[in-house]
Structures are given as structure tokens and as C-alpha cells.
Interface confidence: low
């Protein structure tokens, strides 16, 4: 999906307003020095693109992302601020639900969403300063 | 209104320095980058670098690392450029460019830079 | 550091024709791409960004479009306030570089 058509604005409030909140408490009980940050991204698009991915692409140790509550809200605020994503997204929320049965967190997925953190903080201040 | 309003024309003596100002008004001027571009008489644009106004963490490239020194005053929401070692070469229109995600939706009216004897 | 070649470097055209400038970059810089126009004693404006979208209050004769590395900017019917230079730049990275503009003239 081109993400170059969002509306970045409308998603970064719904970020601030409640996503950033969600990760907060997926995260409660973890330090923040715990995981080191090794995704990034260059602008918003970018940053979208590799938010998507973590967010919802199963991963090997982490497979349980998709029905947080985070990842439930991301999905809502890429469909309503992003022309066209949901139609791009049906064989993929397939899928998630085979993937998908029961909520279990793992160190993996910690760490998944320590990455999420990082690129959602990046989405808010985008321009990379080194490539 | 965005602004972006540059200091007025400098003409120095070659090994010289001159400090060329950018101020920004209408928006947060923390919230972008301050990028700086050089364009020669006759020539195309060069990018410089850029500053982070938040954190004033700058980033040049290697053709200007001893030449540009880039610097903000957030109490005046000011980005400024300084040139030193002046050489015939440095002979330009200098601009300030504003960017979120690295194009420039809002430029200074540019500052031009003459070096001669 | 990514090139950016632009072509032509110059062009002589009429009011009403469709004029169209293309830039390739050394490499995939996916949408991240923009266009400026610079008249004479003037700062860039610009154009379009992200390759294909307009910048506010940019008539709608203007368009960007993208294949791969290859990307064209396209005035549909040039007007007489269209006659400037032309620059491309990609925003993908650090560090940012421009193509060596194009001049459109009038025939």
C-alpha cells in the first residue's frame, strides 16, 4: 500500500490521543533501556509502512499482535485517514485471523512493540538525520 | 502566515566569514527542520544541510563540514548560517528552506554572498 | 549519495503546449520525490511532492508520476507564468540532492 496519501496529521492525533497510550500499558512492567530500537524510518509514508508491518505481519516468536488494542486502533485510524487501505487490507485480516486464536505475550512481542514505539515517536518527528 | 525572512546582502573580503540569518514565523518553529541551500550564479541548487531547531543536532555534508556552521535561537525562532574562510567559490545565493519529510514547502527569499577582493 | 539526472536541460516551448521533464535517480527512492519551479532572482516554490501529489494552490495543469526510477513532471497546457526552471530533488534520505533543473523557454 502507498501510504503517501494519508492524512499524517489526523493519524498523528489519534495517535497521541490514544495508540501511544496503548502501547504504554502493552509495555507496563518493561523498561524503556530494555530493548534497543533497530527499525527506523526516513519519513511518514516510510513510517507507516514499517508500522503496518510490525503491527500486523506475524513474526517468528511474536504471531499475537493484531487484536491488541493498539493494533485495533492503528487499523481503524490507517482505514479512516488512508484512502483505499482497507480494500488492500481483507486478505490480509484473513489471515490474521487463522494466525490468531489467543493473546499471548512474549519477550518477542515486547520487544516488537518496543520497535513500534520507536517508529511511531519517528512518525511524529520523521526526517531521518543520517541514512 | 509562514515566513521564512533572510538577512539582506553581504559583500566580503576573500577569508572572511559572514553570518546569514533566517526567521520563521507562522508556525512552531521547533516542530521543523531548517535546511540551507546554496545555489552559484548561473548554477542549480545544492543542499548544505540542516538543523533540528528542537535539539539543534545538525547535519552537513562533507563539502561543508569546515565551511558551514549551523545554529538556532529558539527564544527568536532564528536559524542562522555561518560561512567561513571565504573563497570566490563560496559567491552565492544562500537559502533557508522549513521541511517535515525532506521537500521545502516554504523557502527564504534567499541571501546573496559575494567574495572579492 | 543518490544522483539525481534531469532532462532536458532546456526546452523551447509555446502557451498550450503540453510539456513533460523527467529525472531518474541512481536509485529506488520509492515516491520520494519533488518538484520546484524558480523564475529568475526568485526561491524554489513547490510544486509537487511524494512524486505525484500537488502542493496547495498549485494549478491543476501541473502533475507528477512515477515508474520505477524514472519520474516526469507534466505541464498539460503551458501558460505564460510557466516559463522558469524546473529542479527535481528526492526527500528519501540524507543526504538530499537536486537534478541540474530544466529551463523552459518560450519558442
Known amino acids: 500500500y502507498d501510504f503517501t496519501n494519508c492524512d499524517f496529521e489526523k493519524i498523528k492525533a489519534a495517535y497521541l490521543s490514544t495508540i501511544s497510550k496503548d502501547l504504554i500499558t502493552y509495555m507496563s512492567g518493561t523498561k524503556s533501556t530494555e530493548f534497543n530500537n533497530t527499525v527506523s524510518c526516513s519519513n511518514r509514508p516510510h513510517c507507516l509502512t514499517e508500522i503496518q508491518s510490525l503491527t500486523f505481519n506475524p513474526t517468528a516468536g511474536c504471531a499475537s499482535l493484531a487484536k491488541e488494542m493498539f493494533a485495533m486502533k492503528t487499523k481503524a485510524a490507517l482505514a479512516i485517514w488512508c484512502p483505499g487501505y482497507s480494500e488492500t487490507q481483507i486478505n490480509a485480516t484473513q489471515a490474521m485471523k487463522k494466525a490468531r486464536k489467543s493473546k499471548v505475550t512474549t519477550n518477542k512481542c515486547l520487544e516488537q512493540v518496543s520497535q513500534l514505539q520507536g517508529l511511531w515517536r519517528r512518525f511524529n518527528r520523521p526526517l531521518l538525520k543520517q541514512q | 502566515e509562514v515566513q521564512l525572512v533572510q538577512s539582506g546582502a553581504e559583500v566580503k573580503k576573500p577569508g572572511a566569514s559572514v553570518k546569514v540569518s533566517c526567521k520563521a514565523s507562522?508556525?512552531?518553529?521547533?516542530?521543523?527542520?531548517m535546511h540551507w541551500v546554496k545555489q552559484a550564479p548561473g548554477q542549480g541548487l545544492e543542499w548544505i544541510g540542516m538543523?533540528?531547531?528542537?535539539?539543534?543536532?545538525?547535519t552537513l555534508i562533507q563539502k561543508f563540514k569546515d565551511k558551514a556552521t549551523l545554529t538556532v535561537d529558539k527564544s527568536t525562532s532564528t536559524a542562522y548560517m555561518e560561512l567561513s574562510s571565504l573563497r570566490s567559490e563560496d559567491t552565492a545565493v544562500y537559502y533557508c528552506?522549513?521541511?517535515?519529510?525532506?521537500?521545502?514547502?516554504?523557502w527564504g527569499q534567499g541571501t546573496t554572498v559575494t567574495v572579492s577582493s | 549519495d543518490i544522483q539525481m539526472t534531469q532532462s532536458p536541460s532546456s526546452l523551447s516551448a509555446s502557451v498550450g503546449d503540453r510539456v513533460t521533464i523527467t529525472c531518474r535517480a541512481s536509485?529506488?527512492?520509492?515516491?520520494?520525490l519533488a518538484w520546484y519551479q524558480q523564475k529568475p532572482g526568485k526561491a524554489p516554490k513547490l510544486l509537487v511532492y511524494?512524486?505525484?501529489t500537488l502542493a496547495e494552490g498549485v494549478p491543476s495543469r501541473f502533475s507528477g508520476s512515477v515508474s520505477g526510477t524514472d519520474f516526469t513532471l507534466t505541464i498539460s497546457s503551458l501558460q505564460p507564468e510557466d516559463f522558469a526552471t524546473y529542479y527535481c530533488?528526492?526527500?528519501?534520505?540524507?543526504?538530499?540532492?537536486f537534478g541540474g533543473g530544466t529551463k523552459v523557454e518560450i519558442k
Open positions: 538543523i533540528d531547531p528542537s535539539d539543534s543536532e545538525t
Open positions: 511524494f512524486a505525484k
Open positions: 528552506a522549513r521541511t517535515l519529510d525532506g521537500y521545502y514547502d516554504y
Open positions: 507562522g508556525y512552531t518553529f521547533t516542530t521543523y527542520w
Open positions: 536509485e529506488n527512492i520509492y515516491s520520494y
Open positions: 530533488q528526492h526527500h528519501y534520505g540524507t543526504p538530499w540532492t
